[in-house]
């Protein structure tokens, strides 16, 4: 009796694990084994697929094969007993394209009202994601064990801290990875649960703000109790993305170590151009608070978020406003390479009734204006990142008269 070729071959790739599954064509025939060959693009010869020869089950693992994951390969399978079936060819595929991101590893630390989540790729030193290690982002779902109401948090990196939790409460979460550059979404990790601790005697400092005065940064915060000492630490924000290393080398700001006031002043040259995280801790000599919420601090934005510059093209019933980069001394434009939102305020020159438009685009239409009427416009920029939460001052008002009727085209 002729052996039939196996059918329905599935290739599952998760991280660096390559698994093949298939269906037996004839369940009635016993003691059948299966073997695979593979062929690389541009090659004529077929090579035996190690790990997938003379297999008695309908599953095999060929992870040990060192493939170029970006190179297309073709597989074929046949059944063997005394004789062999014809080969069944599997559609060719590129491992990287087919690969799924496996569940990440999750490590949790508990405080009284916060949980620190450290996330690592599920496969250490993965070949599949070797070029994408720093591109992983993660999303998580968290819920109180007692309620089950889920909250989703998107676009986090390998270290994330969730605040404003309840003490002595068990929280559960699961995490998945994504490679947005390759449109890949991974599978969720197992569920991890952790209980927050009893409430700490000392609360962490709150409402941390940075401002600029002369050549100094002024860091201010609020605290519940008097007669405390505080310390401030900083970390390069990009270090939160480091997938393999969970040793975060927070650094002391020398002028903000053991300060007895709820502010500290330090020279701007302490920080080179960049984005940093800042955190503050309180101590009464015996006890210490947990660290405050970490605030993001961008030296560029902090130093100078300039008001936008804009031109107005007047029509009969609208203004078209074109927003450009602000100018610095010498009339050179300032390159602000972070996303901004523009707030545009406009009013009829003879009235105090202001109207507001919020836009992400740099070309904005102000609609519903009256012809031959003078309107004034001013604008300011806001950073789009709610953690930075910076705004420029308003630009000077520019007043223009709308055109006569029927010129809206």
């Amino acid at each position: 009796k002729n052996l039939k070729s196996p059918q329905k071959v599935e290739v599952d790739i998760i991280d660096d694990n390559f698994i093949l599954r298939w269906n037996r064509s004839d369940e009635s025939v016993g003691n059948v084994t299966f073997s695979f060959d593979y062929q690389k693009t541009g090659m004529d010869n077929w090579i035996k697929l190690s790990g997938c020869q003379n297999i008695t089950s309908t599953k095999c693992n060929f992870s040990s094969l060192k493939l170029n994951v970006y190179e297309e390969i073709k597989l074929r399978i046949r059944a063997e007993k005394e004789n062999t079936s014809s080969w069944y060819e599997v559609d060719s595929f590129t491992p990287f394209r087919k690969a799924q991101i496996g569940p990440p590893e999750v490590h949790l630390e508990a405080e009284d009202k916060a949980i620190v989540i450290h996330i690592s790729p599920g496969t250490k030193d993965s070949v599949m994601w070797a070029l994408d290690g720093l591109s992983f982002t993660y999303s998580l779902v968290i819920w109180k064990n007692s309620s089950g109401v889920e909250e989703r948090i998107e676009n986090i990196y390998s270290r994330h801290k969730i605040y404003k939790l309840s003490p002595e409460t068990t929280y559960c979460l699961k995490v998945k990875a994504a490679l947005l550059t390759s449109w890949k979404i991974g599978v969720y990790s197992p569920v991890h649960c952790i209980k927050t601790t009893v409430e700490n005697e000392l609360p962490p400092p709150e409402n941390i703000e940075v401002s600029v005065q002369n050549q100094n940064y002024v860091l201010k915060w609020d605290y519940t109790y008097a007669n405390m000492t505080f310390q401030v630490q900083w970390l390069h924000a990009f270090l939160k993305r480091n997938p393999g290393n969970h040793l975060y080398k927070w650094k002391q700001i020398p002028d903000c170590e053991n300060v007895k006031t709820t502010q500290c002043v330090f020279p701007q040259n302490v920080f080179q151009k960049g984005i940093y995280l800042l955190r503050v801790q309180a101590s009464d000599g015996n006890n210490t608070s947990f660290w405050s919420e970490e605030i993001k601090f961008d030296t560029e934005i902090q130093a100078f978020l300039l008001p936008p510059v804009f031109n107005i093209r007047s029509l009969s019933d609208s203004f078209h406003i074109y927003i450009g980069a602000p100018k610095q001394s010498g009339n050179t434009p300032v390159i602000q390479d972070y996303p901004l939102i523009y707030e545009i305020i406009f009013w009829e020159n003879t009235s105090n009734a202001e109207r507001k438009i919020i836009e992400k685009k740099t070309d904005v239409t102000v609609p519903n204006l009256k012809p031959l009427t003078v309107y004034c416009v001013k604008a300011r920029a806001h950073t789009m990142d709610e953690k930075l939460n910076k705004s420029s001052v308003f630009s000077d008002a520019v007043c223009e008269k709308t055109k006569p009727g029927n010129t809206s085209k």
Epitope: E109, A110, V198, K251, N286, F290
Partner: antibody
């Protein structure tokens, strides 16, 4: 394989100074913290301090602030503990330890036995 | 400084038993606690970090638990090779501090 190589023993006179070394292999000390821990016979463990070899930043336990100086040489992948004005109280085993992920002490050297005696 | 107290200096147990070594912190340290094992004549070896995470290669009979101020290292099915001293340590605030140690004796 991660290893922290320390010399077995040092014998020094009271009032003198000593510099203990710890040479790491299997990892780059710049990527970690390097700590020093003291253990006297039949006693517990005392944290002396640590260094960030990447930039030389140090932290010390108040008790050792004056007596101890921790340094590192990244070119030889070595951390050092300099102990000054030695007394019999400084007789102990000194361990160098790697501060790894989440700040924990994941690898310990075999220790150097320092004996201060005239 | 945070004081880590291991109230039992010695504990006696038999092979196959389950034993719990406790450690109390003088203030809330979250889950920032590690446990180390030191066998006679050897340097300490890391067992547990972040209160409950086992280092790779550490037998699963060693389990860490606790948060806030109270922490426990449990050894189930004690083996003769577990004869050692066990230290807890807080890693949340400088100076890092250790407990005084608990010596496990095998009957």
């Amino acid at each position: 394989e991660v290893q922290l190589q320390q010399f077995g023993a040092e014998l020094v006179k009271p009032g003198a100074s000593v510099k203990l070394s710890c040479t790491a292999s299997g990892f780059n000390i710049k990527d970690y913290y390097m700590h020093w821990v003291k253990q006297r016979t039949e006693q517990g463990l005392e944290w002396i301090g640590r260094i960030d070899p990447e930039d030389g930043e140090t932290k010390y336990a108040p008790k050792f602030q004056v007596k101890a100086t921790i340094t590192a040489d990244t070119s030889s992948n070595t951390a050092y503990l300099h102990f000054s004005s030695l007394t019999s109280e400084d007789t102990a085993v000194y361990y160098c330890v790697r501060g790894g992920n989440f700040y924990y002490f994941d690898y310990w050297g075999q220790g150097t036995t320092l004996t201060v005696s005239s | 400084d945070i004081v880590m107290t291991q109230s039992q200096k010695f504990m006696s147990t038999s092979v196959g038993d389950r034993v719990s070594v406790t450690c109390k912190a003088s203030q809330n340290v979250g889950t920032n606690v590690a446990w180390y094992q030191q066998k006679p004549g050897q340097s300490p070896k890391a067992l547990i970090y972040s209160a409950s995470y086992r280092y790779s290669g550490v037998p699963d009979r060693f389990t860490g638990s606790g948060s806030g101020t109270d922490f426990t290292l449990t050894i189930s099915n004690v083996q003769s090779e577990d004869l050692a001293e066990y230290f807890c340590q807080q890693c949340i605030n400088y100076p890092y501090t250790f407990g005084g140690g608990t010596k496990l004796e095998i009957k």
